[in-house]
């Protein structure tokens, strides 16, 4: 067993005229991802035939947006290696297919738009355990630079990963089913660097940073001895190590997780974290692919050009998670404004608006005049996102629902007496004062302290009648404007109320469906 590793160094326009400026189409930004497919032997196989040695899909690269004036650079690539695990011997000769895919991000609402930008196919000879091999390949107008290697996973070694080895000091380990351990060669290549503190005597690792225990030892660093000796006969002590005792209480001893899964201890048991493409209690079930239908809720499964490659799910609106298995709580984004109630109906969102607001997201402010009409002949006045009622004489309060005593505010100045009247109030002024509110003193010479009239507008001036007529016309125009405003507002209310009733009916229908 082992791993084929591919490192993409750069992907960009090749040299020479006619090189593309951007991998993206005119529809906007895009990002790249790569797919590697391995086939045994050197035969020229059709691209669609299965990737018998394995396949892998990279993560998505960073978003690329073309700069109009800048020269086309090497494009931003996904991080990390592409790794293709192989279970059997490494064949030595193989076909390497690398595909560069473009994912367009112009409009994600309708799902991804992706297309194959370039495909390179190379037939190669490669020994496992050797150094990185570098290559540059052209695919149409594009150029791809990459390195690759095959490496064995301990205890396998050799150019085909068929020889088994162990550290010289390590005791024999038992295979599955408690059979005698397979004969192992004594020589080993330098082991990978294990987790810091991992016991040199009782621990080993197959991947850098891990610490796996030999029989008879347990604990995160393999320092804790299991109570019984590791290689006693099953039916009592035996001079020959023909059998092994069942591993001790450490549930992760000997790592029960297959296919590169990592084991973590849980109370009285263990849990395997499987690498992408494997599942099952011990990661023993071969890779999940698009052929398993892993994308729930109508997600699109993207797996390159054959059913046996790794997969990625593109989720339709309302779903998320690596398998589109989680419903997005779209109401958590608080799409309904002005205190509207959000309802997620699955295929759509609905906002139930508070009185005074309307629209799909309750974005239209009706200034509350809809739900709180002014009573007793009052008129609703808009302004500043709030409503105000201008009440008819004799009424007051927020909605003109309260009877008002017009004399309560003592409107008559200078000791004038207030009399309530059906049309308002009347002030009887104290001697020496005049005016509607007794606000003007009367001078001894009989002339009131009224503001002086402009020249040419003295009492009895012939122009006076004309000015009065103009004022009357202006007042009538203002009154007419207010009437028109009130009528149009009432029509608007009726329209929104009708729409709201219709929307509520639809909402009930959808919720009951």
């Amino acid at each position: 067993a082992g791993v084929f590793e591919l490192q993409i160094h750069s992907f960009g326009p090749g040299p020479g005229p006619g090189a593309p400026r951007s991998p993206c189409s005119a529809r906007g930004p895009c990002r790249l991802f790569f797919r590697v497919c391995l086939k045994p032997g050197l035969s020229e196989e059709a691209a669609e035939s299965p990737c018998a040695l394995g396949a892998a899909l990279s993560a998505r690269g960073p978003v690329y947006t073309e700069q109009p004036e800048a020269p086309a650079p090497d494009l931003p690539l996904p991080n990390g290696l592409l790794q293709v695990p192989f279970r059997d011997a490494w064949p030595g000769t193989f076909s390497l297919i690398i595909e560069t895919w473009r994912e367009e991000l112009g409009d994600q609402i309708g799902g991804p738009a992706w297309s194959l930008l370039a495909r390179v196919t190379r037939r190669r000879r490669l020994a496992a355990g050797g150094p990185w091999a570098r290559d540059i390949q052209r695919a149409g107008a594009w150029e791809l630079r990459f390195s690759y290697r095959a490496r064995c996973e301990l205890p396998a070694v050799g150019t085909a990963c068929t020889r088994l080895c162990r550290p010289r000091s390590a005791p024999s380990r038992c295979g599955p089913g408690l059979r005698p351990c397979a004969p192992l060669e004594d020589e080993c290549e330098a082991p990978p660097v294990c987790r810091a503190g991992c016991s040199l005597e009782h621990g080993f690792c197959e991947q850098p940073g891990e610490c796996r225990c030999l029989e008879g030892w347990t604990g995160p660093l393999c320092m804790v001895p299991v109570s019984t000796s590791s290689c006693l006969g099953l039916r009592g002590p035996s001079s020959t190590t023909t059998g092994c005792l069942v591993p001790g209480p450490g549930p992760c001893d000997g790592n029960p997780c297959a296919n590169g899964g990592s084991c973590s201890e849980t109370p009285g048991s263990f849990e395997c974290t499987c690498p992408r493409g494997f599942y099952g209690l011990r990661c023993e079930v071969s890779g999940v692919t698009c052929a398993d239908g892993p994308c729930f809720n109508g997600g699109l499964c993207v797996g390159g050009a054959d059913p046996d490659s790794a997969y990625i799910c593109h989720c339709p609106p309302g779903f998320q998670g690596s398998n589109c298995e989680k419903r997005v709580d779209r109401c958590s984004l608080q799409p309904c404004r002005n205190g509207g109630l959000c309802l997620d109906l699955g295929h759509a969102l609905r906002c139930r608006c508070r009185a005074g607001f309307a629209g799909p997201r309750c974005e239209h402010d009706l200034d509350d005049c809809a739900g709180r009409a002014c009573a007793n002949g009052g008129t609703c006045v808009e302004g500043g996102g709030a409503h105000r009622c201008s009440c008819a004489l004799g009424f007051g309060g927020r909605n003109c629902r309260e009877r008002a005593d017009p004399c309560a505010a003592r409107p008559c100045a200078h000791g004038g007496r207030c009399y309530a009247h059906f049309s308002g109030l009347v002030c009887a002024c104290a001697p020496g004062y005049m005016g509607a509110r007794c606000e003007f003193p009367v001078h001894p010479d009989g002339v009131s302290a009224l503001p002086a009239a402009p020249p040419g507008l003295r009492p009895g001036d012939p122009q006076r009648a004309g000015v009065i007529a103009v004022i009357v016309v202006v007042v009538i125009a203002i009154v007419a404007g207010i009437v028109v405003l009130v009528i149009s507002r009432k029509k608007r209310m009726a329209k929104y109320e009708k729409a709201e009733i219709k929307e509520m009916g639809e909402m009930h229908r959808e919720l009951n469906a």
């Epitope: 699109l300 993207v302 046996d308």
Partner: antibody, heavy 120, light 107 residues
């Protein structure tokens, strides 16, 4: 060559159940999905659901939930559609179709169809 | 559910003419759309997938176009074997739905 061979025409009583079959040949059965489509005579097409034979996963149209059950037998490369509690509205031609498992999706091969008649 | 609206519902044309059938999705489905042809008493046949890609063995007189919500299937120089019904189908979110169909008849 790829073929989907469906079972013959069926006559059933209201309230009964009927299991229709679709035998695949000429390709790896577990590398594709099988979708089922209903067509009432003289009308359009309606997708019932899809099964992935490799895993047994099924995805269905909610309109057929409780009405249709999809299964598959890998050993015989056969997919099945069981229609329960039959009524006259279930009288239709039922097609099975091979479905790509990776996007872009499409139904590239169809069975010849099975006519189901529900009558008392 | 995404609704697929096909137009026209029926069309009467002569051999050699060019026809265009349209399909409108109620939501953006990008290019997740296929077209099928069905002849009387037969099963449907795939013509176009991913909105614009011609299926294997389909004559080049057929072409698909569109993206988002508006799609069309064009048949240039109709042949006698092209008469029948045509359906569009989306593949974006469940359930996958078909258009109501367009019946193409000989004039």
């Amino acid at each position: 060559q790829v073929q989907l061979q469906q079972s013959g025409a069926e006559l059933a009583r209201p309230g009964a159940s009927m299991k229709l079959s679709c035998k695949a040949s000429g390709y790896t059965f577990t590398s594709y999905g099988i979708s089922w489509v209903k067509q009432i005579t003289g009308q359009g097409l309606e997708w019932i659901g899809e099964i992935f034979p490799r895993s047994g996963n099924t995805y269905d149209n909610e309109n057929f939930r409780g009405k249709a059950t999809l299964t598959a037998d890998k050993s015989s490369s056969t997919a099945y559609l069981e229609v329960r509690s039959l009524t006259s509205e279930d009288s239709a031609v039922y097609f099975c179709a091979r479905t790509t498992v990776f996007a872009p999706y499409y139904f590239d091969y169809w069975g010849q169809g099975t006519t189901l008649t529900v009558s008392s | 559910d995404i609704q697929m609206t096909q137009s026209p519902a029926s069309l009467s044309v002569s051999v050699g003419e060019t026809v265009t059938i349209t399909c409108r999705a109620s939501e953006n489905i990008n290019s997740n759309l296929a077209w099928y042809q069905q002849k009387q008493g037969k099963s449907p046949q795939l013509l176009v997938y991913a909105a614009t890609n011609l299926a294997d063995g389909v004559p080049s007189r057929f072409s698909g176009s569109g993206s988002g919500t508006q799609f069309s299937l064009k048949i240039s120089g109709l042949q006698s074997e092209d008469f029948g019904s045509y359906y569009c189908q989306h593949f974006w979110g469940l359930p996958w739905t078909f258009g109501g169909g367009t019946k193409l008849e000989i004039r």
